[in-house]
């Protein structure tokens, strides 16, 4: 296993609709054709997997149908979007990138993006 640099933004604020987007960029050390991207959430020293996708270079990034993540890839950067977030989902979201094929295997883990989620205030009842 060889190490690889990964960069991602330090902080992102989710939209009022609970959507957060950020870029995950990695320093590809060679001609990888198969890449796996995983988003991990760290909160209270617990790390859980949020979503993961494997893609072939030049092809679309596809997450499972029931995933809360979507994304696109362009070269050695991945644009990730996480949906359905609520205030309780605030935490550090870490981008993990693996170059699966061809060998050698490379692993890179970013420093994480702190995503802040604020639940919208309910609209007051109106008389209209």
């Amino acid at each position: 296993c060889k190490a690889m640099h990964v960069a991602q933004p330090a902080v992102v604020l989710a939209s009022s609709r609970g959507i957060a987007s950020f870029v995950c960029e990695y320093a590809s050390p060679g001609k990888a054709t198969e890449v796996r991207v995983t988003v991990l959430r760290q909160a209270d020293s617990q790390v859980t997997e949020v979503c993961a996708a494997t893609y072939m270079m030049g092809n679309e990034l596809t997450f499972l149908d029931d995933s809360i993540c979507t994304g696109t890839s362009s070269g050695n950067q991945v644009n990730l979007t996480i949906q359905g977030l609520r205030a309780m989902d605030t935490g550090l979201y870490i981008c993990k990138v693996e170059l699966m094929y061809p060998p050698p295997y490379y692993l890179g883990i970013g420093n994480g993006t702190q995503i802040y989620v604020i639940d919208p205030e309910p609209c007051p009842d109106s008389d209209f």
Epitope: Q8, P29, M57
Partner: nanobody, 126 residues
């Protein structure tokens, strides 16, 4: 859209040095990571080095580490490849390539670059 032009190639004796330049027009190069590659006749394109947007991150494969040095001058919209201790096997056409990135990293994979120069010939011979 950015366009790239390489220069500085030529004939050099074994053990000699050359500095290649990759000049950009049409856009500011500081938005792009830049890589240098080469291709010898009948061989695959080979990665040589890359440099991130700010110049703080560089990468080299083992084959040229210690002999080749990449640098950039964003004020001149140019990236350089300093090549020392040249050998006959360094003879090839040398290309630079650019990729628009958000952060400071760069890639050694030719698959990641979407803009390429036309190349400059380097011949190492006595």
């Amino acid at each position: 859209e950015v366009q790239l032009v390489e220069s500085g190639g030529g004939l050099v004796q074994p053990g000699g040095s050359l500095r290649l330049s990759c000049a950009a027009s049409g856009d500011t190069l500081e938005s792009f990571a830049v890589g240098w590659f080469r291709q010898a006749p009948g061989k695959e394109r080979e990665e040589l080095s890359c440099i991130g947007r700010t110049g703080e991150f560089t990468d080299y494969p083992g084959s040229v580490k210690g002999r080749f040095t990449i640098s950039r001058d964003n004020s001149k919209n140019t990236v350089y490849l300093q090549m020392n201790s040249l050998r006959a096997e360094d003879t090839a056409v040398y290309y630079c390539a650019a990729e628009r990135l958000v952060f400071h990293l760069c890639s050694l994979s030719e698959y990641d670059y979407d803009t390429w120069g036309q190349g400059t010939q380097v011949t190492v011979s006595s």
